[in-house]
């Protein structure tokens, strides 16, 4: 058992001229708070999976109001550390997500409004009991500086918090075969109580005679590395010869979820859905109050001022679960009709409609020409979700209300002159050319390159385009 501790040093604009404006204003004062989510580092969980190692929410920072005209400084931070207790062994490799949230303190109806300013993530190797590790990360235009460490809670010691220490029974030295507990030299390592032969590096125990494996190891003594790449089944126990996991009991057999939690298998392990008042990998963390920040993803915690009274998380749109830890796949209900594309934006659901359909759920079939009149004898053509008028000769525009200038496009070739006419246009061709658009040269001997001009028209006459 132990505690992961996170210290936020600064949150402010990154360097360079494109620094962001302050997230708070005189009209909308605000304050910051942070959330950290921890997962075992080598688990191949989805990004939205619960924070299996735990999570914590900081206190709110001081209220900040932007000074007009001043560049955004590093913003005032909440006091203290974010602490995430862990009950089992510290995994050594862990993933983290740190979110910076803004709480707006203006005149919101229904209380303050929250918005996510920045989110950083990473995977790191970290031994419990080691020094503070520092990090600098950018997220959008913001820069976050922080430190973190994992420390064991007595009597646990060691890089995974799996060794136990006890006060010395004799003042001068430890018992036979027992070493002093560094750095607590006045304490001694507790007698080995794990199953005989249990790997000291990869195994640990919480009860006498047991041998539980750290992530990545298997076998009765935790001496076999898990290698699933060449294995057919993702289940244990292990075949000691191959290091592969061979078919065996499923991860939910015997229900590892405590306190009435329900277990569901995941590709590599299991996931517990905890009842209200409990959380953690196995629903083992209890006595949670709102002060512990149990509501994830911006959920609002209500009640639970003391460990005996349960809290309730009011989840923002798009999240559910007793701790708002589960993302709702609202698009799986196929709310968009008529082939519309569903977009879950977190705060809202949007449907992108196919041509010819409209409405919040694409429920309206657009009769493109309904109520649409095309003027001057034009006819309406449906298509593409918008009406189009096919206009009578001499008219144009969206509704055929504009009188077309048939000569605007300079339709007469070879220097022919264009005249607007009630039925269209007329080209007066230059000498040597003929045709409706003066497109054909007249041969020198008087014969044209095409059949003779229509009766009654000489090759040099204006050709009327009907």
């Amino acid at each position: 058992a132990g505690v992961f501790e996170l210290q936020i040093h600064s949150f402010g604009p990154g360097p360079g001229p494109g620094a962001p404006r302050s997230p708070c204003s005189a009209r909308l004062p605000c304050r910051l708070f942070f959330r950290v989510c921890l997962k075992p580092g080598l688990s191949e969980e989805a990004a939205e999976s619960p924070c299996a190692l735990g999570a914590a929410l900081s206190a709110r920072g001081p209220v900040y109001t932007e000074q007009p005209g001043a560049p955004a400084p590093d913003l005032p931070l909440p006091d203290g550390l974010l602490q995430v207790p862990f009950r089992d062994a510290w995994p050594g490799t862990f993933s983290f997500i740190i979110e910076t949230w803004r709480e707006e303190l203006g005149d919101q109806i229904g209380g303050p409004a929250w918005s996510l300013l920045a989110r950083v993530a990473g995977r790191r190797r970290l031994a419990a009991g080691g020094p503070w590790a520092r990090d600098i990360q950018r997220a959008g235009a913001w820069e976050l500086r922080f430190s973190y460490r994992a420390r064991c809670e007595p009597p646990a010691v060691g890089t995974a918090c799996t060794r136990l220490c006890r006060p010395r029974s004799a003042p001068s030295r430890c018992g036979p075969g027992l070493r002093p507990c560094a750095p607590l030299e006045d304490e001694c390592e507790a007698p080995l109580v794990c199953r005989a032969g249990c790997s000291p590096e990869h195994g640990f125990c919480e009860q006498p005679g047991e041998c539980r494996c750290l992530e990545g190891w298997t076998g009765p003594l935790c001496t076999v590395p898990v290698s699933t790449s060449s294995c057919l089944s993702p289940r244990g126990p292990s075949s000691a010869t191959t290091g592969c996991l061979v078919p065996g009991p499923g991860p939910c057999d015997g229900n590892p979820c405590a306190n009435g939690g329900s277990c569901s298998e995941t590709p590599r392990s299991f996931e517990c859905t905890c009842p209200r008042g409990f959380y953690g990998l196995r629903c083992e963390v209890s006595g949670v109050t709102c002060a512990d920040g149990p509501c994830f993803n911006g959920g609002l915690c209500v009640g639970g001022a003391d460990p005996d009274s349960a809290y309730i998380c009011h989840c923002p749109p798009g999240f559910q679960g007793s701790n708002c830890e589960k993302r709702v796949d609202r698009c799986s209900l196929q709310p968009c009709r008529n082939g519309g594309l569903c977009l879950d934006l977190g705060h809202a659901l949007r449907c992108r409609c196919r041509a010819g359909f409209a409405g919040p759920r694409c429920e309206h079939d657009l009769d493109d020409c309904a109520g649409r009149a095309c003027a001057n004898g034009g006819t309406c053509v449906e298509g593409g979700g918008a009406h189009r008028c096919s206009c009578a000769l001499g008219f144009g525009g969206r509704d055929c209300r504009e009188r077309a200038d048939p000569c605007a496009a300079r339709p007469c070739a070879h220097g022919g002159r264009c005249y607007a006419h009630f039925s269209g246009l007329v080209c007066a061709c230059a000498p040597g050319y003929m045709g409706a658009r003066c497109e054909f040269p007249v041969h020198p001997d008087g014969a044209s390159a095409l059949p003779a001009a229509p009766p009654g028209l000489r090759p040099g006459d204006p050709q009327r385009y009907l």
Partner: antibody
């Protein structure tokens, strides 16, 4: 403006060591880490490690862990990277870069190190 | 270490073209991906960080998108100075690793 200026080209024999410097200017040099990245001829980029000039904490790529040392001189805002037990495959351009864990925003001009007998 | 696979490894295009380069990570790296441009004999230059944030001073014709394992760098309208090699880099895990590069050449 921010500048990282590296030392000149080096030619070394196999088994020797090389020490490349990177002088920072235009910003408070303890505010960001200095990373070292190398690029063999015609190849991609390979991260070697970084030093935090404030704490002198270093973290290295396992491929170089036993051969690389990174130090700093606060008085001159200079960071040094020393690579020992050189082999021919260490022939590369060595870059220093300013940054944090998820960005390298300014780079030095590069130092060519040639390892040849 | 996390592997990054860039495609294509080389690409010929003309000034004014829209160009897309992709980078695929061997596992989920959230949005911890950066894009760098490198010209012959020069140091790489940061273009995009955290998948879609444009570094100061980089023209807006460059844009990045994606999260998880699949990422894209798009140049909306190629300019003569954009012909270079482009690298993606993941910063989710230590050690940071780079893609193999995409060489963008004039057609």
């Amino acid at each position: 403006q921010v500048q990282l200026v590296q030392s000149g080209a080096e030619v070394k024999k196999p088994g020797a060591s090389v020490k490349v410097s990177c002088k920072a200017s235009g910003y408070t040099h303890t505010r960001y880490w200095i990373h070292w990245i190398r690029q063999a001829p015609g190849q991609g980029l390979e991260w070697m490690g970084y030093i935090n000039p404030t704490t002198v904490y270093t973290e290295f790529n396992q491929n170089f862990k036993d051969r690389v040392t990174m130090t700093r001189d606060t008085s001159t805002s200079t960071v040094y990277m020393e690579l020992s037990s050189l082999r021919s495959e260490d022939t590369a351009v060595y870059y220093c870069a300013r940054g944090g864990s998820n960005f390298f925003d300014y780079w030095g001009q590069g130092t060519t190190v040639t390892v040849s007998s | 270490a996390i592997q990054l696979t860039q495609s294509p490894s080389s690409l010929s295009a003309s000034v004014g073209d829209r160009v897309t380069i992709t980078c695929r990570a061997s596992e989920n790296i959230y949005y911890n991906l950066a894009w760098y441009q490198q010209k012959p004999g020069k140091a790489p230059k940061l273009l995009i960080y955290t998948a879609n944030s444009l570094e100061d001073g980089v023209p807006s014709r460059f844009s990045g998108s994606g999260s998880g394992t699949d990422f894209t760098l798009t140049i909306s309208s190629l300019q003569p100075e954009d012909f270079a090699t482009y690298f993606c880099k993941q910063a989710y895990d230590v050690p940071p690793t780079f893609g193999g590069g995409t060489k963008l050449e004039i057609k």
